[in-house]
Amino acid sequence: YDFTNCDFEKIKAAYLSTISKDLITYMSGTKSTEFNNTVSCSNRPHCLTEIQSLTFNPTAGCASLAKEMFAMKTKAALAIWCPGYSETQINATQAMKKRRKRKVTTNKCLEQVSQLQGLWRRFNRPLLKQQ
């Protein structure tokens, strides 16, 4: 999906009002400097691409983020403020339902969410280029 035509300010507002708190809640108990920042993004569409990938694509050691509160709110924000996004996700959602797993917070998931916090932080930068 090409995130170029999203309403970035509305997504930013959704992040600041709710998603950020849900990320904080998920990370509760984690040490500030426990994880290095290794994932980056250069502009807002790129940040959303990386955020979508880390939030919804299962990775080795962390298959369970898509059902977390911050993930569901991220999905809702993208569906509302990115034209055509929800249509591209129908197939992916159906595939995800088939492999639904028990929610387990692993260290790998915490590291992934730490990277997500960094990506969202970059997305919110006022001077970040949109293109």
Partner: antibody, heavy 118, light 107 residues
Framework: QVQLVQSGAEVKKPGASVKVSCKAS????????MHWVRQAPGQRLEWMGE????????DYNQNFRGRVTITVDMSASTAYMELSSLRSEDTAVYYC???????????WGQGTLVTVSS | DIQMTQSPSFLSASVGDRVTITCKAS??????VAWYQQKPGKAPKLLIY???MRHTGVPSRFSGSGSGTEFTLTISSLQPEDFATYFC?????????FGQGTKLEIK
């Protein structure tokens, strides 16, 4: 182990600028955010701003916008905080402090006293 | 910005006493609160993060609790080295803000 070592005390006249340094060691400099926090005599701690050394992006407390500039020298693993248009109320101890993506401060510099006096 | 209001500002107590310091946030900060100890001429030292988690090396007599808008730091049995100033800080929301401090003095 992580260490943050700051430059020495400064005395400045009103209207002048001051530049405080913070040399980091014991970790990969680009991995974490560097913040500056100040404490005026008998006052609460006040967050001034932060820099991401990986790309030098800064965020500032609006109370200081326009007067504070935070920079890094990657080759020296050193962060700098410059405060301009100094006034007597800027007399304070200035600290550098380190965080990851979660913004509480588990590592601090020893502090630099800046005195603004005519 | 979220305001953090600490009480009391001053507290006199004796070695062995149990003391509690309170911090109230002007809006919900979940559990994103840290507590610091500061001695004269020194940098603050992290005691508690995530409202209730003790930092490495912090004695078990220090404990934190709370969520939402009300938080407490408790020292179960004061030791001579505990007389200092204590600050709370919220990191739920940009800009990060601190309480005004509680100075703990020997009675």
């Amino acid at each position: 182990q992580v260490q943050l070592v700051q430059s020495g005390a400064e005395v400045k006249k009103p209207g002048a600028s001051v530049k405080v340094s913070c040399k980091a060691s014991g970790y990969t400099f680009t991995s974490y955010l560097m913040h500056w926090v100040r404490q005026a005599p008998g006052q609460r701690l006040e967050w001034m701003g932060e820099i991401d050394p990986s790309d030098s992006y800064t965020d500032y407390n609006q109370n200081f916008r326009g007067r504070v500039t935070i920079t890094v020298d990657m080759s020296a693993s050193t962060a700098y905080m410059e405060l301009s248009s100094l006034r007597s109320e800027d007399t304070a101890v200035y600290y550098c402090a380190l965080t990851g993506t979660i913004n509480y401060f588990d590592y601090w510099g020893q502090g630099t006293l800046v005195t603004v006096s005519s | 910005d979220i305001q953090m209001t600490q009480s009391p500002s001053f507290l006199s107590a004796s070695v062995g006493d149990r003391v509690t310091i309170t911090c109230k946030a002007s809006q919900d900060v979940v559990t994103a609160v840290a507590w610091y100890q500061q001695k004269p001429g020194k940098a603050p030292k992290l005691l508690i993060y995530w409202a209730s988690m003790r930092h490495t090396g912090v004695p078990s007599r220090f404990s934190g609790s709370g969520s939402g808008t009300e938080f407490t730091l408790t020292i179960s049995s004061l030791q001579p080295e505990d007389f200092a100033t204590y600050f709370c800080q919220q990191y739920s929301s940009f800009t990060f803000t601190f309480g005004q401090g509680t100075k703990l003095e020997i009675k």
